[in-house]
């Protein structure tokens, strides 16, 4: 088992996350652009990515990471091959998924949106020219990055890039393509050993991790199947929470239990976690509610609000569970404990 | 109490296909990582492949790339493993694995009994 540290990740703020939520959207909505407004799109989205570099964390391995990305999809830009472009396609999505989860400042979230979105459309475009454009905006960026701080370590990483793109000019596509596998290979490591602050598939926000359920039980088994994995159905603590988690909610159209009820005592709504229910927080409630019709002791999210509801329907749910802050132990290639009495024979 | 059961093996030729299933209990499978591990004939376990919770994160070891695909079927507690193009040194047992909740690597706490998967013409 993995030691976990209680959350040390400092609270990000509204604002960031709403940008965040934005570029999201931004990423779904691309794919239905024609080919003329996805290339216009790229070059504004090049335009934002250029000023959002110099407001880069400090932190140099995620930087290095940013860094061959860029590297790797410049030189992804130049292959022939549509079925090996494919695949490195997917292995860098998964790992634009994972890089998604670490607990750095928005402003990096934003970063690697861009990209992942950026590459995608890149991949979809059918003339060479074009490629070749892009590929050089890309450089100019990339000349950008050596500009950042920490400057050893930085311009150390920015030369060592600069010969390996060099290198990478001067191969052939055969070779080409070993490189690139090679750099993803050293990639996915580099991600395995950041510290991830949510599980796998959970959405990081403010310090804690959430699960959104893509299946549905009732309020009861939900606080269970939370509770198993060491969280919470959600308890919400703030505004700024709320939104978020309204936004999740009303996003994909769902009816999604929250840790509210009114079940010890009729009319008195009461946390999971033993809070009650702050007079700030009942504005909340869609108009009408909670009215209670038919024994509906239980809180969701439906719509732009809240609502009550009875509490054996069976609905989607939310986990909460604090971001852990993880010292990492050196791993094994399996740490596994049999479900069987014995393990397999090694 | 954590239980996988496989199914699904078999003899194939080379260059077959197979479908292993792993139907879990005793945990909320819908909220776990889930994976394959497997043993060839008198040597070590082999991390095969993961999916995430949702299904939509996915990972490979190199050896399989390309021709194993897992799934899950949050609604029946079921993982899967397509195996396509299959050959002789994909011989193995094949362990149905329940992931570690925060690792992003290939670590599993608990796994099955295994099922059998022989190639060979």
């Known amino acids: 088992q993995v030691s976990k540290v209680p959350s040390s990740i400092s609270q990000e703020q509204s604002r960031q996350d709403a940008i965040y939520q934005n570029l999201t959207q931004l990423k779904a909505a691309v794919g239905e652009l024609s080919e003329k407004s996805k290339l216009q799109e790229i070059y504004q989205e090049l335009t934002q990515l250029k000023a959002a570099v110099g407001e880069l964390p400090e932190k140099s391995k995620l930087q290095e990471i940013y860094q061959e990305l860029t590297r790797l999809k410049a030189a992804v830009g130049e292959l022939p091959e549509k079925s090996k472009l494919q695949e490195i396609y997917q292995e860098l999505t998964w790992l634009k998924a994972a890089v998604g989860e670490l607990p750095e400042k928005s402003k990096m979230q934003e970063i690697y949106q861009e990209l992942t979105r950026l590459k995608a459309a890149v991949g979809e475009l059918p003339e060479k020219s074009k490629q070749q454009e892009i590929y050089q905006e890309l450089t100019r960026l990339k000349a950008a990055v050596g500009e950042l701080p920490e400057k050893s370590k930085q311009q150390e990483i920015y030369q060592e890039l600069t010969r390996l793109k060099a290198a990478v000019g001067e191969l052939p596509e055969k070779s080409k393509q070993q490189e690139i596998y090679q750099e993803l290979t050293q990639l996915k490591a580099a991600v395995e050993r950041l510290c991830h602050p949510c599980p796998w598939e959970w959405t990081f926000f403010q310090g804690n991790c959430y699960f959104m359920s893509n299946s549905q039980r009732n309020w009861h088994d939900s606080i269970t199947a939370c509770k198993e994995v060491g969280a919470q159905l959600v308890v919400i603590k703030s505004a700024e929470e709320q939104n978020f988690l309204q936004l999740q909610s009303s996003r994909s159209n769902r009816f999604t239990w929250m840790g509210l009820s009114d079940l010890n005592q009729e009319g008195t709504w009461q946390w999971v976690d033993g809070s009650p229910l702050l007079p700030s927080f009942k504005q909340y409630w869609n108009r009408g509610e909670p009215n209670n019709v038919g024994e509906e002791d239980c809180a969701e999210f439906s719509g732009n609000g809240w609502n009550d509801d009875k509490c054996n329907l069976a609905k989607f749910w939310i986990c909460k569970k604090s971001a852990a802050s993880c010292s990492r132990d050196e791993e094994q290639f399996l740490s596994p404990a049999p479900a069987t009495p014995n393990p397999p024979p090694a | 109490e954590v239980q996988l059961l496989e199914s699904g093996g078999g003899l194939v030729q080379p260059g077959g296909s197979l479908r292993l299933s792993c139907a879990a209990s005793?945990?909320?499978?819908?909220?776990?990582?889930m994976g394959w591990v497997r043993q060839a004939p008198g040597k070590g376990l082999e991390w095969v492949s993961k999916?995430?919770?949702?299904?939509?994160?996915?990972y490979y070891a190199d050896s399989v790339k390309g021709r194993f695909t897992i799934s899950r079927d949050n609604s029946k507690n079921t993982l899967y493993l397509q195996m396509n193009s299959l050959r002789a040194e994909d011989t193995a047992v094949y362990y149905c694995?329940?992931?570690?909740?925060?690792?992003?690597?290939?670590?599993?706490?608990?796994w099955g009994q295994g099922t059998l998967v022989t190639v060979s013409s």
């Open positions: 005793g945990f909320t499978f819908v909220m776990y990582p």
């Open positions: 694995a329940k992931g570690n909740l925060w690792e992003m690597s290939r670590r599993f706490d608990y």
């Open positions: 999916i995430g919770p949702h299904g939509r994160l996915t």
